[in-house]
Structures are given as C-alpha cells and as structure tokens.
C-alpha cells in the first residue's frame, strides 16, 4: 500500500492533508518496510546475516553513512547541512538499489518498490531543501562502471554485497528519519 493510502487514513476522513514532514516520514517508513521484506529473503537464502562485522567491514563498498560532521547528529545539528547530506546520500544509494533489482526471486516487486519509493523520497526532500546547489549528483559513468563491477563478482560476494547494501541503507534511512523529526 503506498504511503498515505493506508486504512488509518481511510477511516479518518476528517484528518488534515499530510504536511510535507509527515509525507516524508511516511515515505521513509514505507521504504523501511520494503527493506525488511528484502532482508528476510536475503537472510533465509544465505548465512550472510550471521556474518561477523569484521568480515563485512572488509568489503570495499563505499556506502553512504552518517557522521557527526554531516550535521544530522544532535551535537552540531544543522538542518540545511543535514538535509544536503540526506539527499546526497540517497542519490549515492541509487546505483546500489539498481544493483539489487536482479537479486531477488520472490521479492522482485518489493525491490522495485524500494527503488521507486526512494526516487519519490528524494523529490520530497529536494522540495524541502533550500540549498540545492550544494547537492552533488553522482557521475553516471562512474555509476555504470561500478554497477558492472558489482555484477561481475562471484556468487558469495554478490550475496555479501546485497546484504551489506540492505543493512547500510536501513541504517542510513533510520539516521535520516531521526534527524528529520528534529527539524
């Protein structure tokens, strides 16, 4: 069910239309639902979810991560800097979400939903941001070669990459959700 169309909203016709913040909040929660379903399939299919953090850390993926300097943590919180980091991070995740598209059997539609919902979330956030010039869009050529490289990995590494992308994307969205609710 797309955000804003759940039974709660139907049952409460007197409810005010969703604000921009509520829409963003709902969108993130919807994507997190999708990630949860994809992680279930991944964990059932392989033992990656039990892998030690050390083994995961050895993987050389450059996945976006929140750090204190990004202005999203309570100490040094900066709304505009943080918003730029969230949007930039989501744009950087897009190539990894593209990689996920052929990685699922029973959850193929869910993987597509996560990808499309993330695009919508980026649009919502871009409307909220004042300083769009500070947002750097990933280079398409670099993304294309990264995608080719990831798809050329052996089966074990592809399983590991899938697990890592889902885990990191979930963490990034949770950090974003927390920060956005402080705005």
């Amino acid at each position: 069910v797309p955000p804003g169309e759940d039974s709660k909203d139907v049952a409460a016709p007197h409810r005010q239309p969703l604000t921009s913040s509520e829409r963003i909040d709902k969108q993130i929660r919807y994507i997190l639902d999708g990630i949860s379903a994809l992680r279930k399939e991944t964990c059932n299919k392989s033992n990656m979810c039990e892998s030690s953090k050390e083994a995961l850390a050895e993987n050389n993926l450059n996945l976006p991560k929140m750090a204190e300097k990004d202005g999203c943590f309570q100490s040094g919180f900066n709304e505009e800097t943080c918003l730029v980091k969230i949007i930039t991070g989501l744009l950087e995740f897009e190539v990894y979400l593209e990689y996920l598209q052929n990685r699922f059997e029973s959850s193929e539609e869910q993987a597509r939903a996560v990808q499309m919902s993330t695009k919508v979330l980026i649009q919502f956030l871009q409307k909220k941001a004042k300083n769009l010039d500070a947002i750097t869009t990933p280079d398409p050529t670099t993304n294309a070669s990264l995608l080719t490289k990831l798809q050329a990995q052996n089966q074990w590494l592809q399983d590991m990459t899938t697990h890592l992308i889902l885990r990191s994307f979930k963490e990034f969205l949770q950090s974003s959700l927390r920060a956005l609710r402080q705005m």
Epitope: D25, L32, K53, R167, K170, S175, R181
Partner: antibody
Framework: QVTLKESGPTLVKPTQTLTLTCSFS??????????VGWVRQPPGKALEWLAF???????YYSPSLESRLTITKDTSKNQVVLTMTNMDPVDTATYYC??????????????WGQGTLVT | DIQMTQSPSSLSAFVGDGVTMTCWAS??????LNWYHQRPGEAPELLVF???NLQIGVPSRFRGSGSETYFTLTINSLQPEDSGTYFC?????????FGGGTKLEI
C-alpha cells in the same frame, strides 16, 4: 532474552556527582535502530526522561538538565553510563535505564531495568 | 518541547468494567505515541507503541487509538492486575516527554 540492570550509589551528598551504570544483555548497542535511555521517577511522581544514546553514538539530553548530564556507551562491555553533576535533594528518585529498539524509531522503551533508588 | 497531558488523573472501576483514558499532545506527533503501565514498586511496562500497536504479550483487551494530538487507551473487561498508573509518552522527537499519569484503582 533482553535484560537491563542499573547499578550505582544509593546515597549521594549534595553537590556530588552521581554515576550510574546500565549493564544489559540480549541485544547489541551496535545494531541500527537500537538505543538506551535513562528515565527517573521521584517518589509518588511521574516519569521524567533524562538522556538517550543511539547505536551510532548520537546523544540526546533533557534540555532542563543538559548542563549536568553526560551519557556514554561501551559497546564491547554492553554498558551505558550516565553521570549527573551537582546533585541536589530534589534529584532523589528511582533511576531506570531502558531499551528502545524498532525499525521505525518510535522511541518506545520496550524493556526496562528494575530501577535504582538514589537519595 | 511537546507537552503531554493525561486525563483523568485518577479513576476507579470494578473487575469486568471497561475504562478509557486520554492523552493530549501540545502539537501534532502523528502516531508517535506510546503507553506504559506501572504497578507500585515496579518498573513501567510498554503496552502500546505507535498509538495503536499492542506490544507482544499484552492482552487484546487493551486498545490504543488516536493520531496527531489526541490519543486514547481503552481497557475492556478489567482484571485486578490492571490496577496501577498508566503513562503516555511522546515518541515523535527529542526531548521525550511523559504525561502526568492516570492512576487506575480496581
């Protein structure tokens, strides 16, 4: 099974610093979406939130007590420590540590320690 | 900061009765509202999270509802063990705030 337990002094003199330790098991404070908070309750009164620390070391404090509070974590020891400076008789309360852990960050405390009474 | 107000501050009822208590937020908190039950001398226990989701192990006679600024907790078919104080808590953003509590006597 998730458990938390508070430890620290039961008696503190005015102006002294209170150090409370929350030792937990059954979960990891390095898992995304997981956090540990401190809540206190003066005798016969309501609950009051004090501080919170997240898996990624992001920290939040009650604005009215922020200048007196410090929260830290030791992930390898499964511990969270709260220090509260310049203690006063009005700080007499049962101090609880509690876990928050859900994908959507509802900031709900699903498991609590038994509490420790500090006078 | 978001203020949470609970009503009534106390109520009494008989075993088998149903009761409803309310919680108001000073501003919209969507569905980020949690309910706890505390018996004397014990730690609070989570009953309901996200306004209407029952925590695992909580009997179905408990029901949370509401959104934005107005929330209710309804208990049907009261049992002796339901006595104690009920607290609501905003989970929208920091600082986290609790209501003053509703003391229920059975």
């Amino acid at each position: 099974q998730v458990t938390l337990k508070e430890s620290g002094p039961t008696l503190v003199k005015p102006t002294q610093t209170l150090t409370l330790t929350c030792s937990f098991s059954g979960f990891s404070l390095s898992t995304s979406g997981v956090g540990v908070g401190w809540v206190r309750q003066p005798p016969g009164k309501a609950l009051e939130w004090l501080a919170f620390i997240w898996w990624d070391d992001d920290k939040y404090y009650s604005p009215s007590l922020e200048s007196r509070l410090t929260i830290t974590k030791d992930t390898s020891k499964n511990q969270v420590v709260l220090t509260m400076t310049n203690m006063d008789p009005v700080d007499t309360a049962t101090y609880y540590c509690a876990r928050s852990a859900d994908d959507y960050l509802y900031y709900s405390f699903d498991t609590w320690g038994q509490g420790t009474l500090v006078t | 900061d978001i203020q949470m107000t609970q009503s009534p501050s106390s109520l009494s009822a008989f075993v088998g009765d149903g009761v409803t208590m309310t919680c108001w937020a000073s501003q919209s908190i969507n569905d980020y509202l949690n309910w706890y039950h505390q018996r004397p001398g014990e730690a609070p226990e989570l009953l309901v999270f996200a306004a209407s989701n029952l925590q695992i192990g909580v009997p179905s006679r408990f029901r949370g509802s509401g959104s934005e600024t107005y929330f209710t907790l309804t208990i049907n078919s009261l049992q002796p063990e339901d006595s104690g104080t009920y607290f609501c808590q905003s989970g929208h953003s920091f600082p986290l705030t609790f209501g003053g509590g509703t003391k229920l006597e059975i």
